[in-house]
């Protein structure tokens, strides 16, 4: 049975908890007042109390009257000690006390463990004026109480410089169950075992569980909470969710979807960032994930050129952060471009293919075969060259750059000069003789400008000596080759 | 979480005094009940009385009035008893436990050994 | 004083079996309030008491369900469905329903 105390215009009547007598102290008055029959009596100190003296429920007032009579110690009379109600039912208790006239300005606060209530509560403080006493009933009342209104309340009341406290009323709410771990979201492998745990908690206890699948019942028989449903395994999602009942009623979990785990969809969107000469930037948009982490992803690259071999290259890169730097491409070269990712079910199929190019680059290789020799008659340098190959030219060739460097008695000077694309020999003016020219050519293309060849070098005798060879680019092994006449 | 810690055990004479602790942590000290119960060895358990740390008040077993003596300290949340004229029938393990709201012993101190000896 | 009578006093159990333990009150434990204010314990080897079942069949908070109480007036009953071996130790009720508070003389849990 469940005892709820109800708002009513007289007081809540005396209860003596729930142990009869119980709550009544062992001490007596040390002197009775009128209509005090229910006085708490007298806290009596005790010596061997540590710390300061504990200011308890009663105040010893040292104020004599007329008659020079000591006035009594003071204390709450004796309520109920604990009320069980449902919840969102209303409840009403009161504190009562009785005090002498001569006190002034007395105010009674209530207390729910150990703070005291101000605000929004309901707390009316009620006099009843008699000859020599005040009867004062302090009412507590809650319209409609919540869990959070379970506790400890006490009445204080601050007298002559003393507080009296009175002994606890409990308020203990009960209400339907309240849950403290429901099931939560899972997504599992297709036919496989898993456990979902349910439990709820009163009061009142037991709370019994009932298991719900797809709306209807799992369990014919209720199990008692905590409740750990295991499933032996599904083909297709499935809505779970469960009862908890006890005394006062029924309440229901969030449902919660159990998937299966599939493979991915297919990345969307793949998209170029940037492009170099050897390198694309790609970024893509992941698939339905499958109802499971992606673990990595892979960029397959084809030559589009319907000319190549058709052999597919493969980058394997982790699933974040759908960015990945294709590198080690051609120069102005076209590429299909795909993706494809995978969890732990499998791989997604490969995403549409893009087509993408790289740019023009600076040629890779120097121009081959550099020869020079001196045309003296017309004071010049000649010098030949076979054009770098195709492949390695990243670019169509725009031209070439000659570099020459003129070294004679400590001075130094270099010259560049830009040749057109069609040539493959340039005439340049003799700078100085008596002198060393050393002569290196690289090709350009709007990429930019590829490595320079080996250095060729010649030497530009003073003015009256005859018969000239060439000079070339050495053969492999000789460092610095040198003309001598 | 509601904790109760209670004081080393006590060696004590024939007729002396003994005081004993129980720190109270997690909870409104001054708003529940603290009860008091002894276990002789190998025998039940007997209930000695409670203190209402908010304002003091007490209520006692007949059996052991006179023989115990509860106070509390609010000011470091202990409760205390105090053992007097103690005699080899004294010689137990007390423990304090707070009455819950479910008006039950809900937590309970790990317990204090008294043993009286000459 | 509310004398409680608690049989038998030494309960020998295979594990896995059930157990039930009885508790009986010389007057009724039914309070004013309407509420019947029995408790019970359990004290294993060297620990303080812990609550199982607060007023009558209420399991309190992290007790498992295999522990469940019943009863009503002055007779009551703990019952335990499937023993383990954790559950061994001294089984207590407590009614705090009349002042003095009083337990029963306890059941020992033990294995066959």
């Known amino acids: 049975a469940i005892t709820e105390a109800r708002e009513e215009a007289k007081p809540y009547p005396l209860f003596p908890g729930p142990f009869p007598g119980s709550l009544q102290t062992d001490h007596t008055p040390l002197l009775s007042l009128p209509h005090a029959s229910g006085y708490q009596p007298a806290l009596m100190f005790s010596p061997t109390q540590p710390g300061r003296p504990h200011t308890g429920n009663v105040a010893i007032p040292q104020v004599t009257s007329v008659e020079s009579k000591p006035l009594p110690p003071l204390a709450f009379k004796h309520t109920v000690g604990h009320i069980i109600l449902s919840e969102h039912k209303g409840v009403k208790f009161n504190c009562s006390i009785s005090v002498p006239n001569i006190y002034q300005d007395t105010t009674i606060s209530w207390w729910k463990d150990g703070k005291e209530l101000l605000g929004a509560h309901h707390a009316i403080t009620q006099f009843y004026p008699d000859d020599e006493v005040t009867a004062i009933i302090a009412s507590f009342s809650i319209t409609s109480v919540q869990r959070s209104d379970n506790g400890s309340y006490i009445c204080k009341m601050k007298i002559n410089n003393e507080e009296i406290v009175s002994d606890p009323i409990y308020i203990e709410v009960q209400g339907l169950p309240h849950f403290t771990k429901q099931p939560e979201s899972m997504n599992v492998t297709r036919n496989t075992a898993f456990n979902l745990t349910c439990q709820a908690v009163g009061p009142p206890e037991p709370v019994n569980i009932f298991w719900v699948q797809n709306s209807s019942r799992v369990n014919e028989q209720p199990e008692k909470s905590p409740s750990v449903l295991t499933v032996p395994g599904l083909t297709e999602m499935a809505v779970f969710s469960c009862e908890a009942h006890n005394d006062k009623g029924l309440t229901v979990s969030k449902g919660v979807q159990i998937n299966i785990k599939a493979i991915p969809s297919p990345p969307t969107e793949v998209s170029i960032r940037n492009s170099t000469a050897h390198s694309i930037l790609i970024s893509w948009v992941p698939g339905f994930d499958g109802y499971s982490p992606f673990r990595n992803c892979s960029i397959q690259v084809k030559e589009a050129d319907p000319l190549s071999n058709g052999s597919v290259m493969i980058f394997n890169t982790s699933a974040l952060p759908h960015l990945y730097q294709i590198k080690q491409l051609q120069a102005l070269a076209n590429y299909s471009i795909g993706v494809s990712c995978m969890n732990e079910i499998g791989w997604s199929a490969v995403s549409p293919w893009i087509l993408a190019s790289t740019t023009e680059g600076a040629p890779s290789v120097a121009p081959l075969n550099v020869t020079v020799f001196l045309n003296e008659s017309s004071d010049n340098v000649d010098i030949r060259w076979m054009k770098p190959p195709t492949k390695q030219q990243d670019g169509e060739l725009v031209g070439y750059r000659i570099s020459h460097v003129w070294q004679s008695a400590g001075i130094s000077k270099e010259l560049l000069e830009e040749v057109g694309q069609n040539g493959s020999r340039a005439r340049i003016s003799v700078q100085v003789h008596n002198a060393t020219c050393t002569v290196r050519i690289a090709a350009v293309t709007r990429g930019g400008v590829g490595p320079f060849s080996d250095p060729v070098k010649i030497f530009i005798p003073a003015h009256g000596w005859v018969d000239y060879a060439p000079s070339s680019t050495p053969a492999p092994g000789n460092a610095d080759p040198v003309l001598i006449i | 979480q509601v904790q109760l810690q209670q004081s080393g055990p006590e060696l004590v004479k024939p007729g002396a005094s003994v005081k004993i602790s129980c720190k109270a942590s997690?909870?409104?000290?001054?708003?529940?009940?603290i009860h008091w119960v002894k276990q002789r060895p190998g025998q039940g358990l007997e209930w000695i009385g409670w203190i209402f740390p908010g304002n003091g008040n007490t209520k006692y077993n007949e059996n052991f009035r006179g023989k115990a003596t509860l106070t509390a300290d609010t000011s470091s949340s202990t409760a205390y008893m105090q053992l007097s004229s103690l005699t080899s029938e004294d010689s137990a393990v007390y423990y304090c436990?707070?009455?819950?709201?479910?008006?039950?012993?809900?937590?309970w101190g790990q317990g204090t050994s008294v043993t009286v000896s000459s | 004083d509310a004398v409680m009578t608690q049989t038998p006093l030494s309960l020998p159990v295979s594990l896995g079996d059930q157990a039930s333990i009885s508790c009986r009150s010389s007057q009724s434990l039914e309070s004013s309030n309407g509420n019947t204010y029995l408790h019970w314990y359990l004290q294993k080897p060297g620990q303080s008491p812990q609550l199982l079942i607060y007023r009558v069949s209420n399991r309190f908070s992290g007790v498992l369900d295999r522990f469940s109480g019943s009863g009503s007036g002055t007779d009551f009953t703990l019952q335990i469905s499937r023993v383990e071996a954790e559950d061994l130790g001294v089984y207590f009720c407590?009614?705090?329903?009349?002042?003095?508070?009083?337990f029963g003389s306890g059941t020992k849990l033990e294995i066959k």
């Open positions: 436990a707070r009455l819950g709201l479910i008006y039950a012993l809900d937590y």
């Open positions: 407590l009614q705090v329903t009349h002042v003095p508070f009083t």
């Open positions: 997690g909870y409104s000290f001054t708003s529940y009940y």
